[in-house]
């Protein structure tokens, strides 16, 4: 056979679908690899061919589109399962070709099982809600294209094993789940089950997402430097180890980049010759506020080092702050034996 542009196995599209549920999978060629869509390709006389490799097999085989009740079918650039079976797991290839052109891509499809509380190996999308922010909604994801707008599905929402009913602050509203006022107790996994009829059969779509309640922008503040501060003086003798922590609190801000850095005499530590190391640790509160600590360390400090300016800087989308550490050389303690002796007139 003639050469074919092979885009290989597109592992970025690790598609997971639930066993015994409908699944519609678009050929990735038109979404990620080619500059034209299926309609254009079809008009130009190109044909879309599907085949697959079963899990733990090397042999590519055609997809059987003659199964009872059209369990697997193709419609335009979509491969349909009505419904999936566990042994549909494998690598699927869609190939677009005519006599002069060929392009193909493979992608993994994993059919996963769920238990009665919707636990499964499925990777879950995370939806962040602001704490105590007023009404916020999540929407049952990835159900478009499964049934026509004339069909009115029934939607049931669950939190874990439990149907969402009579909850204090969570109200199911069809495809949406409304949080009247999101609290930490609303953290968790929420599942919508969409039930719809098709050709005398009933199908279910199960979609689970994780809700994480995070700090509200109403309460967000610029970075707060807790250390260094005016109450602590780093007093050292030459030869001792100098350790200065820079501890900064960042309010949660969606898509904000939190940064902490030290300057020594106005320069980044990498740009100066002294032997300095910086270790960073990060911790998060339950609402994803962040505390970053960068410890500046000089193993054997010199008297010149103790005259330098050590400034901790922090920046987020809310602003930039800086604070200098109070560093000084320890004054040697008086040597009492000599000085007291001198005081008593000894020679």
């Amino acid at each position: 056979s003639e050469r074919c542009d092979d885009w290989g196995l597109d592992t970025m599209r690790q598609i997971q679908v639930f066993e015994d549920e409908p699944a519609r999978i678009k050929c990735p060629l038109f979404e990620h690899f080619l500059k034209f869509n299926y309609s254009t390709a079809h008009s130009a006389g190109l044909t879309l061919i599907w085949y697959w490799t079963r899990q733990d097999r090397d042999l590519e085989e055609p997809i059987n589109f003659r199964l009872p009740e059209n369990r697997i079918s193709k419609e335009k650039d979509v491969l349909w399962f009505r419904p999936t079976l566990l042994n549909d797991t494998g690598n699927y290839t869609c190939m677009l070709r005519n006599t002069t052109y060929c392009s193909k891509v493979a992608f993994p499809l994993e059919v996963v099982q769920k238990d009665s509380c919707f636990n499964s190996p499925m990777k879950l999308p995370v939806h962040k809600l602001y704490i105590e922010y007023g009404i916020q909604r999540i929407t049952c994801p990835n159900v478009d294209g499964y049934f026509p707008s004339s069909v009115k599905p029934t939607i049931t929402w669950y939190m874990g094993c439990y149907k969402i009913q009579n909850f204090n602050n969570v109200i199911p509203e069809g495809m949406n789940l409304s949080f009247l006022i999101a609290l930490i107790s609303n953290n968790g996994n929420y599942t919508c089950v969409v039930t719809y009829p098709e050709n005398g059969r009933t199908f279910h779509l199960t979609r689970t997402l994780t809700v994480k309640v995070v700090g509200s922008p109403k309460n967000a503040v610029p970075p707060v430097i807790h250390s260094p501060n005016d109450h602590v003086v780093y007093e050292k003798e030459p030869g001792e180890e100098l350790l200065i922590p820079c501890t900064v609190y960042f309010s949660f801000l969606m898509d904000s980049r939190n940064e902490v850095w030290w300057t020594i005499d106005g320069k980044k530590p990498d740009d100066i010759t002294i032997d300095v190391t910086i270790n960073e640790s990060i911790s998060h509160s339950r609402t994803e506020d962040e505390t970053r600590t960068q410890i500046l360390s000089i193993k054997k400090v010199t008297s010149e080092d103790l005259k330098r300016s050590y400034v901790c800087h922090a920046r987020s989308a809310k602003g930039e702050v800086a604070k200098a550490a109070k560093v000084k050389q320890k004054v040697p303690a008086p040597r009492y034996t000599v000085e007291l002796a001198c005081g008593f007139g000894a020679t």
Epitope: D115, S116, C117, N119, G160, K163, I164, F167, S185, G188
Partner: antibody, heavy 122, light 107 residues
Framework: QVQLVQSGAEVKKPGSSVKVSCKAS????????IQWVRQAPGQGLEWMGY????????DYAQKFQGRVTITADESTSTAYMELSSLRSEDTAVYYC???????????????WGQGTLVTVSS | EIVMTQSPATLSVSPGERATLSCRAS??????LAWYQQKPGQAPRLLIY???TRATGIPARFSGSGSGTEFTLTISSLQSEDFAVYYC?????????FGQGTKVEIK
Amino acid sequence: QVQLVQSGAEVKKPGSSVKVSCKASGSPAEPYAIQWVRQAPGQGLEWMGYIIPSLGGYDYAQKFQGRVTITADESTSTAYMELSSLRSEDTAVYYCARGQTLYAAGRQFDIWGQGTLVTVSS
Amino acid sequence: EIVMTQSPATLSVSPGERATLSCRASQSVSSNLAWYQQKPGQAPRLLIYGASTRATGIPARFSGSGSGTEFTLTISSLQSEDFAVYYCQQYNNWPWTFGQGTKVEIK
């Protein structure tokens, strides 16, 4: 170690109500459900309903709808089951039970209270 | 609602022998089945969930099997403390329902 401690035995007249309490110790940080199950003398187990104290969600078995009310007081980690319009066939041991989380399939009855005997007699 | 039927109602077994208890669901419950043990005057205790997974602290002589509508609890070698009533429970569909119980007594 999580424990459920229930209120003491009750003797009630037909037509009256009973309210049984179930106090949890060592509650986990994440939401959980309290289930109520009853067992008539020499009979099997019968699920009555549940409540999720931190979220307020509840549901009742069809058989008990209109007669049972399950509530919870989060501040005292106590759940309550009230059954009204009592009749002699409501004579049973009433149990509360719970799991560690809302997500553990098959483990929603991990921990049980010691049971409360309710006798309905004229 | 799903009806759970246990058999036999009573099982007479000698200590050290194997006991096999059955539970049938009126419709498929997949593997969403639990087994409980209840001794006189005590609350039930979770033994098995997910049809075959032993709960924490349950001895290995207890094992569960089955899926769909037919389930079995096996006690490989009965100890004196195993004589009790055993209940199965499905949690595939609401309302969660229990079987009527099997009493395992000393032969």
